[in-house]
């Protein structure tokens, strides 16, 4: 890895415990302000492997409510707007970082969690073997 | 939102700051180990809509190595193998969390920064209007 | 509502070339791309040559390669399409398209007649 200088100005919380505990500011920053408005707007409805979103919310998670996208069919929809099943919808998923509170109920006290998320689905070719 | 009844147990760390500075526990606690290893594994290379994985470094951000997907067509791969320039390949973006080091270079001070990831490419179908 | 004004095609020599401009305006829309069609008589509209907005990547169909060459302004949400070398087999109604919504709607023009003449 990459050594970093330790800032002299950096808070001085020496780590006593391990596992490693840190000082992280809610606060948060959006660095998104410059991208396309419209991400992935209708995508779910307009791909040839169509995705419905699901809520999930969990209170004890950081953030609270995640959307996981289920895909809508086991094939994909062709040029004639029909499915075609020697294609399949997959989903694309993502490990993303998560904040858990712990112990449980505790408004200043969080673990990080990595989970995984399906964020949308594409649309893949099976590679067909042939069985003797 | 949901009320939680705060845990008695919970660490004392009365909030002085605002914005709000809470404590995290970096030792990542992983919930993957029931999914399915193979994840989006080759998708990237047998979508119709197949993407590139770029390395996105940033030795002041936690983590500090994200992969960033960039779709390889302007269109799709249509049955013949041969790229539909009809329908478009677009990346499926997620807003995700991720810790940078606030002040800069120090090793247990962060703050929580929401960033834009294309984590894949879906095939989708353009709806066509004429200009009259 | 997204507005396409196209340059007038024309009449060329076998061999010549013809210089194609199409200008997107109305409102606001962020462009995702800019594509060429052409529809020959008694023919399926094909794909000529399109541009991604955000990386500037060019591509064109095998039948124009080498010959024809797109390229942008994207401050003015310009394309142009310089043909040259062109064959009695490029005569067909060419159309502007462009991209907007990320990719999910396109405007597609009213198209300009380029007939080539052997």
């Known amino acids: 890895g990459i050594t970093i200088p330790r800032n002299p100005g950096c808070p001085n919380s020496e780590d006593k415990n391990f596992p490693r505990t840190v000082m992280v500011n809610l606060n948060i920053h959006n660095r998104n302000t410059n991208t396309n408005p419209k991400r992935s707007s209708d995508y779910y409805n307009r791909s040839t492997s169509p995705w419905n979103l699901h809520r999930n919310e969990d209170p004890e998670r950081y953030p609270s409510v995640i959307w996981e996208a289920k895909c809508r069919h086991l094939g994909c929809i062709n040029a004639d707007g029909n499915v075609d099943y020697h294609m399949n919808s997959v989903p694309i998923q993502q490990e993303i970082l998560v904040l858990r509170r712990e112990p449980p109920h505790c408004p200043n006290s969080f673990r990080l969690e990595k989970i995984l998320v399906s964020v949308g689905c594409t649309c893949v070719t099976p590679i067909v073997h042939h069985v003797a | 939102g949901i009320t939680i009844p705060r845990n008695p147990g919970c660490p004392n760390s009365e909030d002085k700051n605002f914005p709000r500075t809470v404590m995290v526990n970096l030792n990542i606690h992983n919930r993957n180990t029931n999914t399915n290893p193979k994840r989006s594994s080759d998708y990237y290379n047998r979508s119709t809509s197949p993407w590139n994985l770029h390395r996105n470094e940033d030795p002041e951000r936690y983590p500090s190595v994200i992969w960033e997907a960039k779709c390889r067509h302007l269109g799709c791969i249509n049955a013949d193998g041969n790229v539909d320039y009809h329908m478009n390949s677009v990346p499926i973006q997620q807003e995700i969390l991720v810790l940078r080091r606030e002040p800069p270079h120090c090793p247990n001070s962060f703050r929580l920064e929401k960033i834009l990831v294309s984590v894949g490419c879906t095939c989708v179908t353009p709806i066509v209007h004429h200009v009259a | 509502e997204v507005q396409l004004v196209e340059s007038r095609g024309g009449l060329v020599q076998a061999g010549g070339s013809l210089r194609l401009s199409c200008a997107a305006s109305g409102g606001t829309f962020s462009v995702f791309a800019m594509r060429w069609f052409r529809q020959a008589p008694g023919k399926e509209r094909e794909f000529v040559a399109g541009i991604s907005w955000t990386g500037g990547t060019t591509y064109y169909a095998d039948s124009v390669k080498g010959r024809f060459t797109m390229s942008a302004d994207n401050a003015k949400n310009t394309v142009y399409l310089q043909m040259n070398s062109l064959k009695p087999e490029d005569t067909a109604v060419y159309y502007c398209?462009?991209?907007?919504?990320?990719?999910?709607?396109?405007?597609l023009g009213q198209g300009t007649q380029v007939t080539v003449s052997s």
């Open positions: 398209a462009v991209d907007v919504g990320g990719g999910s709607d396109r405007y």
